[in-house]
Amino acid sequence: VPGEAEQPAPELVEVEVGSTALLKCGLSQSQGNLSHVDWFSVHKEKRTLIFRVRQGQGQSEPGEYEQRLSLQDRGATLALTQVTPQDERIFLCQGKRPRSQEYRIQLRVYKAPEEPNIQVNPLGIPVNSKEPEEVATCVGRNGYPIPQVIWYKNGRPLKEEKNRVHIQSSQTVESSGLYTLQSILKAQLVKEDKDAQFYCELNYRLPSGNHMKESREVTVPVFYPTEKVWLEVEPVGMLKEGDRVEIRCLADGNPPPHFSISKQNPSTREAEEETTNDNGVLVLEPARKEHSGRYECQGLDLDTMISLLSEPQELLVNYVSDVRVSPAAPERQEGSSLTLTCEAESSQDLEFQWLREETGQVLERGPVLQLHDLKREAGGGYRCVASVPSIPGLNRTQLVNVAIFGPPWMAFKERKVWVKENMVLNLSCEASGHPRPTISWNVNGTASEQDQDPQRVLSTLNVLVTPELLETGVECTASNDLGKNTSILFLELVNLTTLTPDSNTTTGLSTSTASPHTRANSTSTERKLPEPESRG
């Protein structure tokens, strides 16, 4: 067309994909009558008639725009709906009278890409590679026009750098006309990049201006050789027997080498491999003193077969051995003396305490307990506690039973028992002494003896209440080689109408138990002699 070069620049109309473009014919009244206009689309310099306006009435031409065009603004504006990327072209309106004039409109189409999707190279990158390796791929789908990509490392944009950083971008056109951008970041990484955060940013334009979208941040597996291996012990601080202890190998390489943990045999001085769990952790549970010793870790790089050894680490599992008391089963005459000595070994300084088992009273702070002028009441349990003051909870104890030679000692001297004639009565009688006494009854019945502890015995008698029994009462006699002693049980008939037994009597209609733990007119005191034991 002659004079084309002098044509003014087309008017720019910007619109987003899917919306409606309003193409306003900019011919002035002097340039043409808008009631008689032809609209053309120009593609590759070829004009195609797409719409006619006659006497203000519009008519679409058959073709790709047939369904999407309509007239607005009293015929001055052509509306194009459902804009697609393919609609990015020049549209022109041509007035026929008084002379042929045209007005050009450049339609620019935009579409924001989807959120960029970043995928890190799952295989990782070795630090000693000769050329840049693929770090990550960024994909921005369905944008128009093609967005720009910028790569960032630790928040700073990456520039192309020969043999160091290379960004390789490509795009594909979807059937919709939209672009999908793929950008591959290749780089030579160093060990310090193991924690580096990479992300990509898509820059794009919309009618409203410039915009950008950022991907999530990713880190890439960076492989670098191990230079050092070391041991770590949990928990930190003083360890004691019974603790759960974990010994693990650590290395500064990625991937970590193949670990093995060994302990020095104190006899041979040889390192002996320990069995670790699936995670390569040596778990000592419960820790014992035998676990103490020198541990080291070996890291073997399976690629290079280079082996590294950690600094040895001394592990100390603090312990208190079994507590030994001597004499272990002391027997003494009344009036004599007794020295109890407590011994234990420990990895730390020990503190000893002697306690009276029955009362918990602290008798002595130290390993030796001296008891003078022993009375029968001094018999029973004494506990030695060996503890490590610097390690709470690390202690062991041993109970020793002191036996005082003597004739039987009755739990009660006399007791009243309320009974009913012809009932079967269950009577019990308790005695203590050293040697342990035996109990006999002065009436016939079924008796059974139960040893309560080394110095105490309980005898139970089942007997039928008869008038003779009511008359005589019941006696139990405890004897040992040093003498004998008797308890008397007085039987009283229950008067059902007036029965209000006092608190020191035992009542029963079918059975009645004279328990030594309820004392009537008692002239002796009872005591519990616990069993010896050793416990950690």
Epitope: A328, A329, D453, P530, E531
Partner: antibody
Framework: QVQLVESGGGVVQPGRSLRLSCATS????????IHWVKQAPGKGLEWIAR????????YYNEKFKGKFTLSVDKSKNTAYLQMNSLRAEDTAVYYC???????????WGAGTMVTVSS | DIQMTQSPSSLSASVGDRVTITCRAS??????????MHWYQQKPGKAPKLLIY???NLESGVPSRFSGSGSGTDFTLTISSLQPEDFATYYC?????????FGQGTKLEIK
Amino acid sequence: QVQLVESGGGVVQPGRSLRLSCATSGYIFTNYWIHWVKQAPGKGLEWIARIYPGTDITYYNEKFKGKFTLSVDKSKNTAYLQMNSLRAEDTAVYYCARSGGYWYFDVWGAGTMVTVSS
Amino acid sequence: DIQMTQSPSSLSASVGDRVTITCRASKSVSISGYSYMHWYQQKPGKAPKLLIYLASNLESGVPSRFSGSGSGTDFTLTISSLQPEDFATYYCQHSRELPYTFGQGTKLEIK
């Protein structure tokens, strides 16, 4: 130190009697029990009886009751085992041993051999 | 009567070996934590010698290589490392009730 010394053993004819002595020293005689234990040649140990010198109370193994009798002389700190109606099966070494009230034998005499033979 | 059964009746071992002798009672010989079981060593022509009393207590003067354990009816005498002077016959004895009885003995011989 604590010592127990048996004496009175020897060769005796069947049906005869013998009294074994156990002289003690080094401890308070009346505070401990004296036991007698039999060991036939090549055999194991058999408990015969015990006596508490403080009260003269005795207990016997039913197997030896009526045949053997225990006694003490507190003034001499000595215990005795009177053996009656001896038979060949009574041939053995007889030991006296001391115990406390838990009845384990912490001190033993060297034993005296009794041979019943015609 | 409570029967005491020792096993083995005899055994051969070498110096330095760890040896275990067991004794089983026909009923329990324990009372609330105290086990009335004792062990003795007897050498030919000598009187028995107390090693362990009340199941696990080492008699004064007895080497620590000897130890005892057990409760109820089953008991063990262990010699951790045999010494030449340990070759002898070993007896267990209960004192839970009358009459007191001994095991039949275990003869420990040099291999």
